[in-house]
Interface confidence: low
């Protein structure tokens, strides 16, 4: 028996078409993804294939405008008119709360949303029964296909879950709800969450009965064969892992951004074995029509998207210099601005020792695109703000040594002077350098913000300490010359979108006057 | 004085489990990021995992899955829970706090096929 298992993940509210590197799109005849696409291609599987399931992988939310103005409707609305059989939950869909993933998707989605490791508690434990599920069994054809759903347990650290969800760690929780389809003859059992290619790789080895993982959270792109865009393969299209118990359980994942469709083909047999899996990711390119009910959809709700992004989210009664004159030299106020916005969108305080889990954030000069002049009213609007940030990134939760931190502190000014992009602005960090000594020597002083303290202070940058630092994906990736931090960073998570981090602030602020007040020093 | 005491070592068998234990004294337990090392015969020392004073992990590759590290800041107590034990885990296990401080006696583990 053949099931062919198509799956999307971290799609990151990605409805309309991108360029290549999933921005937005300019040059229509070279862009790629989007729903209409993706849909044209899914109709064309299911007409040629007999058993089909099209599966998500979690992290809909969050991305772009469309989730800032429809938080979470326009993903139940889409998915439900591409008819996706199931959903795991990821960390981003707790982005606006419990209530912000109940309202617009739980209660709105035509197919089952799943994760077997968050459990409620307390009130809500009533008012989210059957609304998520641990486990569905689905029928394909003439047999039965069990989905056992799985979120990232660092949830709590990446996004709002609140304090009425337990996420247990993964493979206690799964291995029960496999028993259980087990005991209700289910045999062929598909893995399908949001936790991390290590993870999914560490379910396929440990997790008893689970026949093939299905993938999400680290943007992993596999692939066998040359592949067809600029995505580099972390390894073969499925990555097999043999589990403790002898088999060859295939695992996949497709990158993100709905730039490509997984499309897995598996074989079983009559027990519910994998006899054999083969596939690649699609890439979704515009040599696939956009399909144009979705595509005439797509444009009747972008229409509150336009409106949107002139209107007012708060007011500056100070110049933001964003210029790169001052911003690539020396401390900016539009970096303090950033820096200071990104700390706030990650205020979890999970722990009573620690009066926050981050203090600290650094931002590449040369990310800052624009100034925004307080002499219009004030007036900030998103359409001022995607000038500022026009690159559609993210702002990621990373842990570095110290050591490396202060490599890229040195890195920082190792060419100071000649307006390059990686002089870094910051928060939560005290940097005082040296110009005058030799390049990769230049750091005398940097002093970062404790996070284990009632009062926060600076304290020295200790070279063998781990820390959590905000930055731009960008930098995550060792962009603008960075590669100490992508070489040496000890954990990266996938954060928001830069705008709707700043405009979020803006909002909560209402008035805000960020000031130069000696962050970045020179001695 | 920075003092490291190991203890837990000893001869398993291949799948086998073990329990390390270090003990600390002389240092700011609390928040001090504490580090597993191991130096088979013959090479040089390295890392194994690390625990932040927060509590967050890190493994090397080769024993990620099945090593635990975790600590009792109450007892100044890092511990390294060690499963699935393999002839290539024989080694003298060390704790530290800033690598490069003084070192312990370790403790030897031996794996046997």
């Known amino acids: 028996w053949e099931l062919t298992i198509l799956h999307t993940n971290d799609v990151h509210s990605r409805l309309e078409q991108t360029s290549e590197d999933s921005s937005k799109c300019v040059n229509a005849s070279r862009c790629m993804g989007g729903v209409a696409r993706l849909f044209t291609k899914v109709q064309q599987i299911r007409r040629a294939e007999p058993n089909v399931l099209l599966l998500d992988a979690g992290d809909q939310y969050q991305g772009t405008i469309w989730f800032t103005v429809y938080k979470g409707a326009e993903v139940a609305h889409f998915m439900n008119a591409l008819r996706y059989d199931a959903m795991a939950l990821g960390n981003h869909e707790f982005d606006n709360g419990v209530e912000g993933l109940i309202e617009p998707l739980l209660k709105e989605a035509k197919f089952p949303i799943l994760s077997a490791n968050i459990k409620a508690k307390g009130p809500l434990a009533s008012q989210i029964s059957g609304l998520y599920l641990p486990y569905k069994v689905l029928p394909v054809g003439d047999e039965v296909v069990g989905i056992v759903g799985y979120t990232s347990k660092e949830t709590p650290f990446l996004s709002n879950p609140g304090t009425n969800l337990v996420f247990e760690d993964e493979i206690t929780a799964l291995q029960p709800e496999v028993d259980k389809l087990k005991t209700l003859n289910v045999n062929k059992i598909i893995a399908l969450g949001h936790s991390g290619f290590e993870m999914d790789k560490l379910i396929a080895q440990k997790v008893r009965g689970v026949d093939v993982v299905v993938g999400g959270h680290s943007n992993t792109f596999l692939y066998t064969g040359n592949p067809p865009s600029k995505e580099v393969p972390a390894g073969k299209y499925p990555f097999i892992v043999t589990s403790d118990d002898g088999r060859k359980v295939p695992v996949v994942q497709a990158y993100a951004f709905g730039k490509y469709l997984g499309y897995l083909k598996i074989e079983f047999d009559e027990r519910g074995n994998v006899i054999s899996s083969h596939g690649n990711p699609i890439l979704l390119n515009s040599s696939i029509p956009e399909d144009p009910s979705i595509k005439a959809d797509i444009n009747k709700w972008r229409i509150k998207l336009d409106n949107y992004s002139t209107q007012e989210l708060g007011k500056t009664i100070v110049y933001l210099d964003g210029s790169s004159q001052s911003c690539r030299f020396r401390e900016c106020n539009m970096g303090n601005l950033i820096c200071d916005a990104m700390i706030n969108n990650n205020l979890r305080h999970t722990d009573e020792m620690f009066w926050n889990h981050v203090s600290m954030c650094i931002l590449n000069g040369g990310g800052i695109r624009s100034p925004i002049d307080e002499r219009n009213n004030g007036t900030i609007t998103w359409e001022n703000l995607a000038a500022v940030l026009p690159f559609g990134g993210t702002f990621d939760l990373v842990q570095l040594k110290g050591s490396t931190l202060k490599k890229a502190f040195e890195h920082s000014v190792h060419r100071y002077g000649q307006s390059t992009g990686e002089f870094l602005q910051v928060g939560g960090i005290h940097v005082v350098y040296d110009l005058s000594r030799k390049p990769g020597d230049r750091v005398v002083k940097l002093d970062v913000l404790c996070t284990k303290c009632r009062v926060p202070s600076y304290d020295p940058l200790k070279m063998d300490e781990v820390y959590k630092v905000i930055l731009p994906n960008f930098l995550a990736n060792g962009g603008d010359g960075f590669q100490m931090i992508k070489d040496e960073l000890l954990r990266h998570d996938s954060g928001d979108q830069d705008i709707n981090v700043v405009s979020t602030y803006i909002s909560k602020m209402k008035v805000i006057y960020p000031a130069v007040e000696g962050r970045i020093k020179f001695s | 004085q920075v003092k490291l005491q190991e203890s837990g070592g000893g001869r398993v068998q291949t799948g086998g489990s073990l329990r390390l234990s270090c003990a600390a004294s002389?240092?700011?337990?609390?928040?001090?990021?504490m580090y597993w090392y191991r130096q088979a015969p013959g090479e040089q020392r390295q890392l194994v995992a690390l625990?932040?004073?927060?509590?967050?992990?890190y493994y090397v590759d080769s024993v990620k899955g099945r090593f635990t590290i975790s600590r009792d800041d109450s007892k100044n107590t890092v511990y390294l829970q060690m499963n699935d034990l393999k002839p290539e885990d024989t080694a003298v296990y060390f704790c530290?706090?800033?690598?490069?401080?003084?070192w312990g006696q370790g403790t030897q583990v031996t794996v046997s096929s």
């Open positions: 625990i932040t004073d927060r509590g967050n992990t």
């Open positions: 530290n706090s800033i690598p490069g401080n003084d």
């Open positions: 002389g240092i700011s337990f609390s928040i001090t990021t």
